[in-house]
């Protein structure tokens, strides 16, 4: 039953293009190329690609012929390496390409940003846009490959051939529309939010990976799979993890090929085997491949099997729990986490592995002891605080939510997080807070039962953004202390952070505040976005400043922009009550 | 520092009933299982059968099931391998091993016994 | 009959890398890395070399490193030197409340 055993194959270009077909090789190459070069112009890419692939085709014609048995990476990193402008557009990152395999693959990959200086995407006109796909379909689709895939260089790349297939769909339908801006902007809209949502999941699986190591992600993993399979058992769930496993470690790896075909065999094994996994998967599996392994990744949690014993049973009140922990560690402990997992959907996975952690850590020191049942007898006493901990918190906040709305909810965190880490840039703190802030509406629309799955593990999240930006300036030794002793306790370690007391306030730089007539023409999203901005720039000033302080600068500043994008002269009008409202806020501030 | 000694060497006639002995000491002997390790002359490793002298429960492979008996003493931290009835194919060395985290992980083995069976 | 296949016999010159495979390893032991690899002198006891397909034991030279694709696990030794010249042999869990497999061993010779 192992999914993933193939023959050896003499060449594995062949091999994958054959497995994958052209038009996903193709695009598959185009994407791993653009989330390791992510400065190169997409004609160059689009060249480089188009060379790979005319050497996949020889390569499928003859097995033997002359480089066809060299490994991917060889393949793709020697290809990379001929990009002329490499040490202008990179720096360092040429140095990589004097390095042998698999030393060269490694040293690409840590060089992958998550923040590149890249333009925002500006959306075009509709019309603009519609005329683009129809005069070159092919071009117009690699090149939304290409955009996404160098601004999240770890993107899920067979999730993103998924996300283009529906964008292609997306302009295939409303470009014909009577009203093509209100057939398409709703759903281009759509596709940018759970594009985000999508990378930033994946993000967090990579940096799992790749900073915690296996063993944390395979333990995540059994914990998610149970909650979703809790009919399954153990040996399914356990096979369904390695498999899932070696196809994430594939893609956070770059090897975006070999993670494609092995997802691909992964659907095809699930759904084979349905009847051993879930009753859920049925429409799943109706699907053609893209859209099923999509479904599957997000489908909902099977029903529970009645009459699950008292998990007490098997793991605290049984006298063999020390030796049923001594024949296999690691087996037990996945035992224990499937059993647990399984019977509470109602638990984030992060929650389940603290629990676990804890459990581990006490037959550890149990087993080792005189009594050792004595001593392991009240573990599951350990387990309240635990579980009371995020139940409280998720209660405050969504009570809170529910009282000031998204926006407010928002300025709410971007005060606590500026105070609690002020050293972060001002970007960061905006962008992670502001997406704090949406797991309000998010989460707390769910009854009980769902509110701490979809919170603490959407909080994880969106703090491993917080974690991966940091990384690449630290600037906070409490958010690298934060972010790397403890992925599942990253979100306790940041809510127990209080004021940091050391922080010397900003100098006041009178610039910062002067704003012009160009927020007048900002959407509706981009103007909150100036106006948090000021906000956390407030906060650095002014650490001690009172929720009601703030609150009235805040309304001050609201009541300027709004009066100054009605005057018939704005800029004067920017410049002018601009003056007055700095000094005021300085006044209130007592700055 | 943890240590495995067994017994010594022993020669034996077919259809005898030797107990071989395997004694722990530096580490608690209760909470690791013990394996036993068969390897005739030329030939691999085999697992025989594992014991975790905790409560003494005990497994066999099942080419040994009803072969041999493996049985622990706690009080004395010491291990036990007993024939029903040796043959000449019996003739081996014999290891114990401790078992940690996993009963495949043998990290301290004893320095082996040799029984030669022959008539 | 070993559950878990390996080579008779394998050769390197020194100063060479060598991989000795051993496959067959069960799914369970597969997920939770449950391998092991021991080193053997003739006459002499065996020695945990790499456990859970890529750890080592405290003591044991970085030459010896472990890896695993599917349901087979790999030793590699690097820069042979000639006392590596002995039988190696792979272990792997085999299931619970079930006695652990080895495989039929493999001898290394240092040419």
């Known amino acids: 039953r192992g999914v993933f055993r193939r023959d050896a194959h003499k060449s594995e270009v062949a091999h994958r293009f054959k497995d994958l077909g052209e038009e996903n090789f193709k695009a598959l190459v185009l994407i791993a190329f653009a989330q390791y070069l992510q400065q190169c112009p997409f004609e160059d890419h689009v060249k480089l690609v188009n060379e790979v692939t005319e050497f996949a085709k020889t390569c499928v014609a003859d097995e033997s012929a002359e480089n066809c048995d060299k490994s991917l990476h060889t393949l793709f990193g020697d290809k990379l390496c001929t990009v002329a402008t490499l040490r202008e557009t990179y720096g360092e990152m040429a140095d990589c390409c004097a390095k042998q395999e698999p030393e060269r693959n490694e040293c690409f990959l840590q060089h992958k940003d998550d923040n590149p200086n890249l333009p925002r995407l500006v959306r075009p006109e509709v019309d603009v846009m519609c005329t683009a796909f129809h005069d070159n379909e092919e071009t117009f689709l690699k090149k939304y490959l290409y955009e996404i895939a160098r601004r999240h260089p770890y993107f899920y790349a067979p999730e993103l051939l998924f996300f283009a297939k529906r964008y292609k769909a997306a302009f295939t339908e409303c470009c014909q529309a009577a009203d093509k801006a209100a057939c398409l902007l709703p759903k281009l809209d759509e596709l940018r939010d759970e594009g985000k949502a999508s990378s930033a999941k994946q993000r967090l699986k990579c940096a799992s990976l790749q900073k915690f190591g296996e063993r944390a992600f395979k333990a995540w993993a059994v914990a998610r799979l149970s909650q979703r399979f809790p009919k399954a058992e153990f040996a399914e769930v356990s096979k369904l993890v390695t498999d899932l496993t070696k196809v994430h470690t594939e893609c956070c790896h770059g090897d975006l090929l070999e993670c494609a075909d092995d997802r691909a065999d992964l659907a095809k094994y699930i759904c084979e085997n349905q009847d051993s996994i879930s009753s859920k998967l049925k429409e799943c599996c109706e699907k053609p491949l893209l859209e099923k392994s999509h479904c599957i990744a997000e489908v909902e949690n099977d029903e529970m099997p009645a009459d699950l014993p008292s998990l007490a049973a098997d793991f605290v009140e049984s006298k063999d729990v020390c030796k049923n922990y001594a024949e296999a560690k690691d087996v037990f402990l996945g035992m224990f986490l499937y059993e647990y997992a399984r019977r509470h959907p109602d638990y984030s996975v992060v929650l389940l592995l603290r629990l676990a952690k804890t459990y581990e850590t006490t037959l550890e020191k149990c087993c080792a002891a005189a009594d050792p049942h004595e001593c392991y007898a009240k573990v599951f006493d350990e387990f309240k605080p635990l579980v009371e901990e995020p139940q409280n918190l998720i209660k405050q906040n969504c009570e809170l939510f529910e009282q000031l709305g998204e926006y407010k909810f928002q300025n709410a965190l971007l005060v606590r997080y500026t105070k609690k880490v002020p050293q972060v840039s001002t970007p960061t703190l905006v962008e992670v807070s502001r997406n704090l802030g949406k797991v309000g509406s998010k989460c707390c629309k769910h009854p009980e039962a769902k509110r701490m799955p979809c919170a603490e593990d959407y909080l994880s999240v969106v703090l491993n953004q917080l974690c991966v930006l940091h990384e690449k300036t630290p600037v906070s030794d409490r958010v690298t202390k934060c972010c790397t002793e403890s992925l599942v306790n990253r979100r306790p370690c940041f809510s127990a952070l209080e004021v940091d007391e050391t922080y010397v306030p900003k100098e006041f730089n009178a610039e910062t505040f002067t704003f012009h007539a160009d927020i007048c023409t900002l959407s509706e999203k981009e103007r909150q976005i100036k106006k948090q901005t000021a906000l956390v720039e407030l906060v650095k000033h002014k650490p001690k400043a009172t929720k009601e302080q703030l609150k009235a600068v805040m309304d001050d500043f609201a009541a300027f922009v709004e009066k100054c994008c009605k005057a018939d002269d704005k800029e004067t009008c920017f410049a002018e009550e601009g003056k007055k409202l700095v000094a005021a806020s300085q006044a209130a501030l007592g700055l | 520092e943890v240590q495995l000694v067994q017994s010594g060497a022993e020669v034996k006639k077919p259809g005898e009933s030797p107990k071989i002995s395997c004694k722990g000491s530096?580490?608690?002997?209760?909470?690791?299982?013990i394996g036993w390790v068969r390897q005739m002359p030329g030939e691999g490793l085999e697992w025989m059968g594992i014991?975790?002298?905790?409560?003494?429960?005990?497994r066999y492979s099942p080419s040994f099931e009803g072969q041999v008996t493996i049985s622990a003493d706690k009080s004395i931290s010491t291990a036990y391998l007993q024939w029903s009835s040796l043959k000449a194919s019996d003739t081996a060395m014999y290891y114990c091993a401790r078992l940690h985290g996993v009963v495949s992980r043998g990290d301290y083995w004893g320095q082996g016994t040799l029984v030669t069976v022959s008539s | 009959q070993s559950a878990l296949t390996q080579p008779a016999s394998v050769s390197g010159s020194p100063g060479q890398s060598i991989t000795i495979s051993c496959s067959g390893i069960s799914s369970l032991a597969g997920s939770y890395n449950l391998v092991s690899w021991y080193q053997q002198y003739p006459g002499k006891a065996p020695k945990l070399i790499i456990y859970e397909v890529t750890k080592r034991p405290s003591g044991v030279s970085n030459r010896f490193s472990g890896s695993k694709s599917g349901n087979t696990a790999s030793l590699t030794i690097s820069g042979l030197q000639a006392d590596d010249e002995a039988e190696y042999s792979c272990?792997?869990?085999?299931?619970?409340?079930?006695?652990?497999?080895f495989g039929g061993g493999t001898q290394l010779t240092v040419l």
């Open positions: 014991i975790y002298p905790g409560d003494s429960d005990t």
């Open positions: 530096g580490y608690s002997f209760t909470n690791y299982w």
């Open positions: 272990s792997s869990y085999a299931g619970r409340n079930a006695v652990a497999v």
